[in-house]
């Protein structure tokens, strides 16, 4: 759970449920100042094992955008282009926070929310040798 | 923003900041039912890059463990196990949302917040720059 | 309408060749993968070779490695498969499927097949 | 490689019955899994891949699921069209392997 002693100076929580609900203040703080969000831009391409990003849209949700990455190839891209059957493209799979408008439609009340989604793909080999 | 006209069954914010700081339920619910979470658990060894998961703890944060992969090679693990150091190991990056206790200690007011987590790591082709 | 018309099967003795083609139209034959997948009399289906679309990347099983080879004509819409060094246990319809995408993973396509006896 | 043991090898059912038909790979094959139809004297016809996607034309009685080794294909009320045999075919280690089939006979 995340109960942890109450400051002084924290706000009151009216709400029975407390600490079900929670207040949130969305302005986003980033703390990615340092990080050039466009270095791994192009990773997708140059990939041995590249993918296409896909846009997934909900307004109900808090973000919106989701991008979700679809691995191009079943097997895995070789120096000379083509595919290598003995290795596999597969999605590299993220559990992410999210939050649900709840109930529907409101612009104010939210419900936190688990979704897994790809971020990308590794190029892996298929069977696993057990040593004796 | 995500300014979508209120229901009328929706909860009142009595917040002078509204739409800035929102009600949001802890009651986490989970999309992935259908998902095993242990597929592609074994995805960071059997890459042909490889990582390494490290546990990033801060009690501050919900959630509070976040694990963050380290690639382990420079390069890419051929199929012989030994590392080309023509390709590059890479990790995939993705922004993930978190909520970050403000004030500090507090259990029930938290800001959103924005962070860069690598997800795994990914094989590509090195970017030659040409001298003309 | 896609199809793919297998020919060149027959009768032909252990240690011979044959040579198989597989004619394929109503698609753009050079942005798919293709295989051979054969059958013997009453049973079930086995993976012979794999082509991707420019004929860059092939593989064979273990069980005709170094005796059959495939190869594509995509100017002529055409897959091949040479047989060599051909035995009993290859008796078999041999089928040319097509995979949906580039590469021949699984075959959404297959022709009718065409039957190879080997026997003296 | 990769073994595919399809059961059972063989069913009788009728016309509106529910047939439930297993694939159990020897090791995960992590969805790449394809059922296919065939008919006496006639090729296979593709039904379903990645386990669960059925491909278009097919009808929904037909449906693919499963996950990890273990893979069904179930017909939810069976028609004489579909009296026929099935295989499976996994697509996740070279070489591809196919189970070796279940035929469905009338009753």
């Known amino acids: 759970g995340i109960a942890i002693p109450r400051n002084s100076g924290c706000p009151n929580s009216e709400d029975k449920n407390f600490p079900r609900t929670v207040m949130v203040n969305l302005n986003i703080h980033n703390r990615n100042t340092s990080t050039n969000p466009k270095r791994s831009s192009d990773y997708y391409n140059r990939s041995t094992s590249p993918w296409n990003l896909h846009r997934n849209e909900d307004p109900e949700r808090y973000p919106s955008v989701i991008w979700e990455a679809k691995c191009r190839h079943l097997g895995c891209v070789k120096a000379d282009g083509n595919v290598d059957y003995h290795m596999n493209s597969v999605p590299i799979q993220q559990e992410i926070l999210v939050l649900r408008r709840e109930p529907r439609h409101c612009p104010n009340s939210f419900r936190l929310e688990k979704i897994l989604v790809s971020v990308g793909c590794t190029c892996v080999t298929p069977i696993v040798h057990h040593v004796a | 923003g995500i300014a979508i006209p209120r229901n009328s069954g929706c909860p009142n914010s009595e917040d002078k900041n509204f739409p800035r700081t929102v009600m949001v339920n802890l009651n986490i619910h989970n999309r992935n039912t259908s998902t095993n979470p242990k597929r592609s658990s074994d995805y960071y060894n059997r890459s042909t890059s490889p990582w390494n998961l490290h546990r990033n703890e801060d009690p501050e944060r919900y959630p509070s463990v976040i694990w963050e992969a380290k690639c382990r090679h420079l390069g890419c693990v051929k199929a012989d196990g030994n590392v080309d150091y023509h390709m590059n190991s890479v990790p995939i990056q993705q922004e993930i949302l978190v909520l970050r206790r403000e004030p500090r200690h507090c259990p029930n007011s938290f800001r959103l917040e924005k962070i860069l987590v690598s997800v795994g790591c990914t094989c590509v082709t090195p970017i030659v720059h040409h001298v003309a | 309408e896609v199809q793919l018309v297998e020919s060149g099967g027959g009768l032909v003795q252990p240690g011979g060749s044959l040579r198989l083609s597989c004619a394929a139209s109503g698609f753009t034959f050079s942005t798919y993968g293709m295989s051979w997948v054969r059958q013997a009399p009453g049973k079930g289906l086995e993976l012979v070779s794999i082509i991707n679309h420019n004929g860059g990347s092939t593989f064979y099983p273990d069980s005709v490695k170094g005796r059959f080879t495939i190869s594509r004509d995509n100017s002529k819409n055409t897959l091949y498969l040479q047989m060599n060094s051909l035995r009993a246990e290859d008796t078999a319809v041999y089928y040319c499927a097509r995979d949906p995408r580039h590469d021949g993973y699984f075959f959404d396509y297959w022709g009718q097949g065409t039957l190879v006896t080997v026997s003296s | 490689d990769i073994q595919m043991t399809q059961s059972p090898s063989s069913l009788s059912a009728s016309v509106g019955d529910r047939v439930t038909i297993t694939c159990r790979a020897s090791?995960?094959?992590?969805?790449?899994l394809a059922w296919y139809q065939q008919k006496p004297g006639k090729a296979p016809n593709l039904l379903v891949s990645?386990?669960?996607s059925l491909e278009s034309g097919v009808p929904s009685r037909f449906s693919g699921s499963g996950s990890g080794k273990d893979y069904t294909l179930t017909i939810s009320s069976l028609q004489p069209e579909d009296f026929a045999t099935y295989y499976c075919q996994q697509y996740w280690s070279v070489p591809w392997t196919f189970g070796g089939g279940t035929k469905v006979e009338i009753k």
């Open positions: 990645g386990a669960t």
């Open positions: 090791e995960d094959i992590y969805d790449r």
